[in-house]
């Protein structure tokens, strides 16, 4: 048997081209110079290498760059990026948004993989904060990206970046995340007029406190029920029937369909039945007439 570790005569690769697809895996390993591969990485994607051949090429790069690939190579990895492990990616220093875009493009249409999550983490940590351009890019590829971050991570998002956020980017956010994002959004949109402001802030209202909801109720915003149902229960409870009526406008009729669900259910329990009756919706479960309501939380605070 021929010892298959040395490159056969005449097979040394002079450039990365289509002829290499007919090289055996061991020939690729023996005949393709790693430095040549690194300088011509952009050609690899145009060549229909098999999955196994790509592994050999990756192995060559790993040997050439044991401390991690330089950005000049990373930017042109293309489909070879799908071969990288999170451990490989942790060795990288990615600073260019163009490099990030190029790699996200490779994974486009698939859900966020551990590799992509690691890449984004490395990139954001390298930048120090989630700037608008980065957020723009990430949410374009992964609408749910923002909601995958912890409240601590979200705290590094500057208010200016909030302009890049679309309503669908917040679909999977929980109240803790919206608590962090809402004040940033309020700051970002503070110079807008009433109706425009409401359109922009609406997606973030799951983090709004009671006083902001009271203020909105004075602006004829006509909040839809879907938005209302996402509000913090503790923020909705202190609202009066009149305030909720003003907040929802014509959508107030939708309360009947949601009377058994939070926060509507809990809000009903806190209202006088007399007041609820003024809505004419047949909402039941309010405080009966003649009962005295003691706000124990206020009493505790005073003592």
């Amino acid at each position: 048997e021929v010892e298959k570790t040395a490159c056969p005569s005449g097979k040394k690769a002079r450039e990365i081209d289509e002829s290499l697809i007919f090289y055996k895996k061991w020939e690729l390993e023996a005949c393709v110079d790693a430095a040549l591969l690194a300088t011509q990485m952009d050609r690899v994607n145009a060549i229909p290498f098999t999955y196994e051949q790509l592994d050999v090429l990756k192995h060559k790069l790993d040997e050439l760059y044991p401390q991690g690939y330089p950005e000049s190579v990373i930017q042109h990895l293309g489909y070879l990026f799908l071969k990288m492990s999170p451990e490989d990616i942790r060795k990288w220093n990615v600073t260019s948004l163009e490099t990030l875009k190029a790699l996200l493009e490779v994974n486009k249409g698939h859900e966020m993989s551990p590799q992509v999550a690691t890449l984004i983490d490395r990139f954001v940590k390298g930048r120090g904060q989630l700037d608008k351009d980065t957020l723009d890019t990430l949410t374009a590829f992964y609408p749910g990206y923002l909601c995958s971050l912890s409240p601590e991570e979200l705290s590094s998002v500057p208010p200016s970046s909030i302009w890049a956020v679309r309503p669908q980017d917040l679909d999977t956010c929980d109240p803790r995340q919206l608590d962090v994002l809402y004040p940033k959004a309020r700051l970002a949109f503070q110079n807008m007029n009433g109706s425009e402001y409401f359109v922009k802030i609406q997606s973030f209202l799951g983090g709004a406190p009671t006083e902001d909801l009271k203020a909105l109720s004075q602006q004829n915003v006509s909040m839809d029920l879907a938005t209302f149902m996402k509000l913090r229960t503790d923020a909705v409870l202190p609202l009066t029937v009149a305030e909720v009526q003003k907040l929802l406008g014509p959508h107030v009729e939708g309360l009947k369909a949601e009377e058994r669900h939070r926060p509507v259910r809990d809000w009903i329990l806190r209202q006088r039945q007399d007041d609820l009756d003024t809505l004419g919706l047949g909402l039941q479960g309010g405080i009966p007439n003649g009962y005295l309501v003691l706000d124990l939380s206020m009493q505790e605070a005073l003592s």
Partner: antibody, heavy 122, light 110 residues
Amino acid sequence: QSQLVESGGGLVQPGGSLRLSCAVSGFSLSSYAMGWVRQAPGKGLEYIGYISKIGTTYYASWAKGRFTISKDNSKNTVYLQMNSLRAEDTAVYFCARGSSSGGYLDDGFDPWGQGTLVTVSS
Amino acid sequence: ALQMTQSPSSLSARVGDRVTIKCQASQSISNYLAWYQQKPGKPPKFLIYDASDLASGVPSRFSGSGSGRDFTLTISSLQPEDFATYYCQQVYDSNNVENVFGTGTKVTVL
């Protein structure tokens, strides 16, 4: 003289797991690819997958997720972990070495072990 | 996905006959093809690699040819010990394929 000896076969219930071992001698796992192939009674050869000299693994489409190939170079042993076994997994399981010293499956499998029988039945 | 089709599935022949077995790949695999012989109760025996190169110790009556998609294994003069089942195997792409082996051809005594 290169030798391969499979072990770990036997009777297993549907839904169960089994780990087969392939002890090798006469060559180094860091220089050769190693594969697993099975053969149901009276049927043809069915490729499961292989592990290259550098440890990258490749599987038949039907084996992905349920079957895992690994190796321990220091113990000169290759493993096949089989999960969620079904009656149709009943077969003789062969381990085989990549025939070339290039470390990948480039030329075929040679030599082969004698095989170990796995029966999946309740 | 890359698949291998072998024909015929079985054939009967006499000692001394010339026997030809065909193997077809669903896409071009260059010359990345191996052939095996298997007898009942035994593991397969490696016969040919790179479509036409004889493995060590294999008698010269065995030969292989072909490239691209169509391949042939020929036994020039069948011997008593050659009655067995023969399999082709593509080694072009071994990842995420249904099977790298052909369906097999059983050679029996006429």
